[in-house]
């Protein structure tokens, strides 16, 4: 449950967007779940996945939209401060986390072309960093009407308030557990060897463990792959190279919060895996 106690906005702006693509976009995350998306082409904050059904107050998404339009303006202003050089990608990670004592810990850091270079200092109420680019951007942002105050308000009040609201109103989403559907398949590899692939589909939360057994004994975790699905669930797979003809000695064990106990997955027969 602790991983759910954070609300983070991942903001990205590009100085030279490709035609028809946004110059600025945001994904909002409640723990490991994306609940919000925004981009400069649509200009509206929208709920994602199961959060479409959250019983929110009528003006909630208008407020998210207003705040993100302000952020969009700031981020695109930053490129003007940097001058004509580039291209640039500016990223922000803004949000808050609820500690064990229910106090809020804010986060506000920024990266330029993939390098963290600036933060927002709550005590000093200003953006900090010592790269020349950080000074140029922070100077520009300080000149925007009440920008620093708005950032403080966002981090210290709006964010924890929203997080607590979601914890109340969206508890069903946060407690969602979807067990994985599983497959264990074999395919020929280099001469004399096969690759066993254990695949887990459509599970949530994202924490999942895959491992192989050979005749009941641990045979390793293999080479893994992991990623999100468009509906908010996740997929994962792990592959292990074994001797040809030895495949039937292996099985895959999966552990996941949606399963009452670890699940043993046997190798599919060749006919079934077609």
């Amino acid at each position: 449950a602790e991983s759910h106690l954070s609300l983070l906005y991942h903001l990205t702006a590009v100085s030279s967007p490709a035609p028809g693509t946004p110059a600025f976009w945001v994904s909002g995350w409640l723990g490991p779940q994306q609940y919000l998306s925004y981009n400069s082409l649509r200009g509206e904050a929208e709920p994602c996945g199961a959060w479409v059904w959250e019983n929110q107050v009528s003006w909630y998404w208008e407020k998210e939209t207003t705040d993100l339009r302000i952020k969009e303006k700031l981020f695109l202003e930053a490129f003007k401060a940097l001058g004509g050089k580039g291209p640039y990608t500016l990223q922000g990670l803004l949000g808050c986390e609820l500690g064990p004592d229910n106090t809020s810990v804010p986060t506000a850091k920024f990266a330029l072309n993939g390098e963290e270079f600036m933060n927002f200092d709550l005590k000093q109420g200003t953006w900090g960093g010592d790269w020349p680019e950080a000074l140029a951007i922070s100077q520009r942002w300080q000149q925007q009407d009440k920008a620093a105050n708005k950032e403080l308000t966002f981090l210290l009040f709006s964010c924890p308030h929203r997080l607590r609201e979601h914890l109340e109103r969206g508890r069903g989403n946060l407690e969602w557990k979807e067990p994985p559907s599983m497959r264990l398949k074999a395919r020929p590899s280099s001469p004399g060897f096969s690759v066993l692939t254990c695949s887990a589909f459509s599970f949530y939360p994202p924490e999942l463990q895959l491992r192989f057994l050979r005749n009941g004994l641990a045979a390793g975790t293999g080479q893994g792959d992991f990623g999100p699905n468009s509906d908010g669930s996740f997929h994962a797979s792990s592959s292990l190279t074994v001797k040809s003809g030895d495949e039937h000695h292996y099985c895959c064990i999966v552990q996941h919060a949606g399963l009452a106990q670890p699940l043993r997955v046997e190798l599919e027969s060749p006919a079934k895996s077609s």
Partner: antibody, heavy 118, light 113 residues
Framework: EVKLVESGAELARPGASVKMSCKAS????????MHWVKQRPGQGLEWIGY????????NYNQKFKDKATLTADKSSSTAYMQLSSLTSEDSAVYYC???????????WGQGTSVTVSS | DIVMTQSPSSLSVSAGEKVTMSCKSS????????????LAWYQQKPGQPPKLLIY???TRESGVPDRFTGSGSGTDYTLTISSVQAEDLALYYC?????????FGGGTKLEIK
């Protein structure tokens, strides 16, 4: 030409305070962070902290948090460092240095020598 | 704090010889996202402030002779002087700009025989 000119040598009593200056010229003062570095006689370099002259934002080495106070005056393009509650450990040369690059400070002042003696 | 360790603490060479000095950090100074290293080398001659030689581990500051070369990545860095000149008599410091507090190595003193 970028120049950082620091104030003259200081002789101070233990317990006193000193305030040294670093006047910048040849560039836009508010566009670059000003760092301060300490060097005791025959010793290495120690980073004290930096100030962003445009906003007044400061970042200190915890070791110097209660010792040094960094300020900047935009109108005169001058950065200042005040050292308080001086002891013999504070006897050193103090440098101001501009961070004109992402990964280094590129220009240094000539240094201000502080001697603490009773 | 990141600890920077330089070696040797001093070395004595004849003019024209090649010199290498080492700087090791207690944690990586490499930004894996863009392969940039947050390390600089400075030269300090007696009675003078330090002077920037190399930044980003390997980029020579303008006006610095090309006999000075910086290399390395992660936690291990090297400054090489390909053919030492009499005017290279100085202390050489490395400094990390990866995270505050920015820390310096203890320095390597180069003496000319």
């Amino acid at each position: 030409e970028v120049k950082l000119v620091e104030s003259g040598a200081e002789l101070a009593r233990p317990g006193a305070s000193v305030k040294m200056s670093c006047k910048a010229s040849g560039y836009t003062f508010t566009s670059y962070a000003m760092h301060w570095v300490k060097q005791r006689p025959g010793q290495g370099l120690e980073w004290i902290g930096y100030i962003n002259p445009s906003s007044g934002y400061t970042n200190y080495n915890q070791k110097f948090k209660d010792k040094a106070t960094l300020t900047a005056d935009k109108s005169s393009s001058t950065a200042y460092m005040q050292l308080s509650s001086l002891t013999s450990e504070d006897s050193a040369v103090y440098y101001c240095a501009r961070k004109g690059l992402r990964y280094a400070v590129d220009y240094w002042g000539q240094g201000t020598s502080v001697t603490v003696s009773s | 704090d990141i600890v920077m360790t330089q070696s040797p603490s001093s070395l004595s060479v004849s003019a024209g010889e090649k010199v290498t000095m080492s700087c090791k950090s207690s944690q990586s100074l490499l930004n894996s996202g863009n392969q940039k290293n947050y390390l600089a080398w400075y030269q300090q001659k007696p009675g003078q402030p330090p002077k920037l030689l190399i930044y980003g581990a390997s980029t020579r500051e303008s006006g610095v002779p090309d006999r000075f070369t910086g290399s390395g990545s992660g936690t291990d860095y090297t400054l090489t002087i390909s053919s030492v000149q009499a005017e290279d008599l100085a202390l050489y410091y490395c400094q990390q700009h990866y995270s505050t507090p920015y820390t310096f190595g203890g320095g390597t003193k180069l003496e000319i025989k």
